[in-house]
Interface confidence: medium
C-alpha cells in the first residue's frame, strides 16, 4: 500500500476518505487505527457500527468519528479540533473475524492556522505540481472550528 497524505489545520476538522471495493468488502465492518511504530501494532481508535447495516450511522471516540457508505464503497473518518499530536500514521481497515485488511495507509499532517496570530509560513495551495515517490497528497481542510474538543487520548 502507498501512503496517502491528508493535511489539515490546527483547531479545524480534517476529513479522511478511504475508498474500497463495496462488493469485495460486503458485510464487513470497518475501523480506523493509529500505527504505533514502523513495525508496531495498529491501535484501534474507532470502528463502525456493530450492525453492518447501520454502518452509515456516525460513531465517535473522543474527537474522531467514522461513517461508512457501504454501497458507494467509501469509509470516511473525521478528526475534529486537529492538534499537532494528531499527526502520524493511520490505517483504514476492513474487519473479518479477528483479521483486518488494510484499505488505505494514511499520514496525517497538521499545519498551524495561517489565519491565527501564529503564522504558518507559506501555506501549500492544492493544485501545485508536486512529485512524490510513494505518496499521494490529499488537501482536505474544513474551516469549521470546534472549541473545547478533547482529542482522543493515547493508551500505553
Amino acid at each position: 500500500h502507498n501512503t496517502t497524505v491528508f493535511q489539515g489545520v490546527e483547531g479545524q476538522s480534517l476529513q479522511v476518505s478511504c475508498p474500497y471495493d463495496s462488493m469485495k468488502h460486503w458485510g464487513r465492518r470497518k475501523a480506523w487505527c493509529r500505527q504505533l511504530g514502523e513495525k508496531g501494532p495498529c491501535q484501534r481508535v474507532v470502528s463502525t457500527h456493530n450492525l453492518w447495516l447501520l454502518s452509515f450511522l456516525r460513531r465517535r471516540n473522543g474527537s474522531t468519528a467514522i461513517t461508512d457508505d457501504t454501497l458507494g464503497g467509501t469509509l470516511t473518518i473525521t478528526l475534529r479540533n486537529l492538534q499537532p499530536h494528531d499527526a502520524g500514521f493511520y490505517q483504514c481497515q476492513s474487519l473479518h473475524g479477528s483479521e483486518a485488511d488494510t484499505l488505505r495507509k494514511v499520514l496525517v499532517e497538521v499545519l498551524a492556522d495561517p489565519l491565527d496570530h501564529r503564522d504558518a509560513g507559506d501555506l501549500w495551495v492544492p493544485g501545485e505540481s508536486e512529485s512524490f515517490e510513494d505518496a499521494h497528497v490529499e488537501h482536505s481542510i474544513s474551516r469549521s472550528l470546534l472549541e473545547g474538543e478533547i482529542p482522543f487520548p493515547p493508551t500505553s
Epitope: V5, Q83, E109, F132, P153
Partner: antibody, heavy 119, light 107 residues
Framework: QVQLVQSGAEVKKPGASVKVSCKAS????????ISWVRQAPGQGLEWMGW????????NYAQKLQGRVTMTTDTSTSTVYMELRSLRSDDTAVYYC????????????WGQGTLVTVSS | DIQMTQSPSSVSASVGDRVTVTCRAS??????LAWYQQKPGKAPKLLIY???SLQTGVPSRFSGSGSGTDFTLTISSLQPEDFATYSC?????????FGQGTRLEIK
C-alpha cells in the same frame, strides 16, 4: 538505521545569513516531517519550526517569522534551514529532529550544528 | 503560547536514588507531553511520549505520569549514566514548547 547528519559548525558576522543542512537516511524520507530546534549556550530547547518532507509545507515559530526559511530536497533526502539577519543571540546549537509515531514528539535527532554569531 | 515550567532547575542525587522531576504547563495539554534526556555536547534523546508511554529501547526505570497541567518524570533507581539534563515538551498546540530543563547532578 535512522540517521540525521548535519553540516558542520559555522561562524558568522551579525547581519549575515547561515544555511544548515540535515541529511536523512535509514527511512522513507517523505514519510516524516522534520523540525528544527535550537539551544543557546546554557539555555533550554527552542522549537523553530517544522517542514513537511512531502511538499515543503512549513510552520514557523512566530518570533522567527520572516527570518527563517526551511526547505527540502527529496532527491538527496536533505532538509535545509536558513536563518537571515543574524544577531548575537542567534548563537546556538541547531538541531534537526524527526517527528515520529510518538504523538508529536521527536524520536531521532541530528548531532547538532554550532552557529556562532560574532563581530 | 503554552509555557512549560520545570522544577527543580537542578537536583543532586546518588546512584540508586529515586528521583522525580516535575513539569507544569500554563494551560491544559491533556496527555500530550514528552520527556527528553540530554548529555553535554549531545542531542536530546526521547524517553517518554504521551505523558506515560516509554519510548522503545528506554530502560524501564524511567516512567512518566500526569495529565492536564502537571506531569512527572520518575527515575526509580539512578544509574551512573542517568546524570544529565531532562526536558519536557508539549505537543498539544503550536508553537511546540519545551521546559527550561532540569540538571541532574551527582551528589
Amino acid at each position: 538505521q535512522v540517521q540525521l547528519v548535519q553540516s558542520g559548525a559555522e561562524v558568522k558576522k551579525p547581519g549575515a545569513s547561515v544555511k544548515v543542512s540535515c541529511k536523512a537516511s535509514g527511512y522513507t524520507f517523505t514519510n516524516y516531517g522534520i523540525s528544527w530546534v535550537r539551544q543557546a549556550p546554557g539555555q533550554g530547547l527552542e522549537w523553530m519550526g517544522w517542514i513537511s518532507a512531502y511538499n515543503g509545507n512549513t510552520n514557523y515559530a512566530q518570533k522567527l517569522q520572516g527570518r527563517v526559511t526551511m526547505t527540502t530536497d527529496t532527491s538527496t533526502s536533505t532538509v535545509y534551514m536558513e536563518l537571515r539577519s543574524l544577531r548575537s543571540d542567534d548563537t546556538a546549537v541547531y538541531y534537526c529532529a524527526r517527528r515520529g509515531y510518538s504523538y508529536g514528539s521527536f524520536d531521532y535527532w541530528g548531532q547538532g550544528t554550532l552557529v556562532t554569531v560574532s563581530s | 503560547d503554552i509555557q512549560m515550567t520545570q522544577s527543580p532547575s537542578s537536583v543532586s542525587a546518588s546512584v540508586g536514588d529515586r528521583v522525580t522531576v516535575t513539569c507544569r504547563a500554563s494551560q491544559d495539554i491533556n496527555s500530550w507531553l514528552a520527556w527528553y534526556q540530554q548529555k553535554p555536547g549531545k542531542a536530546p534523546k526521547l524517553l517518554i511520549y504521551a505523558a506515560s508511554s516509554l519510548q522503545t529501547g528506554v530502560p524501564s526505570r524511567f516512567s512518566g505520569s500526569g495529565s492536564g497541567t502537571d506531569f512527572t518524570l520518575t527515575i526509580s533507581s539512578l544509574q551512573p549514566e542517568d546524570f544529565a539534563t531532562y526536558s519536557c515538551q508539549q505537543s498539544n498546540s503550536f508553537p511546540i514548547t519545551f521546559g527550561q530543563g532540569t540538571r541532574l547532578e551527582i551528589k
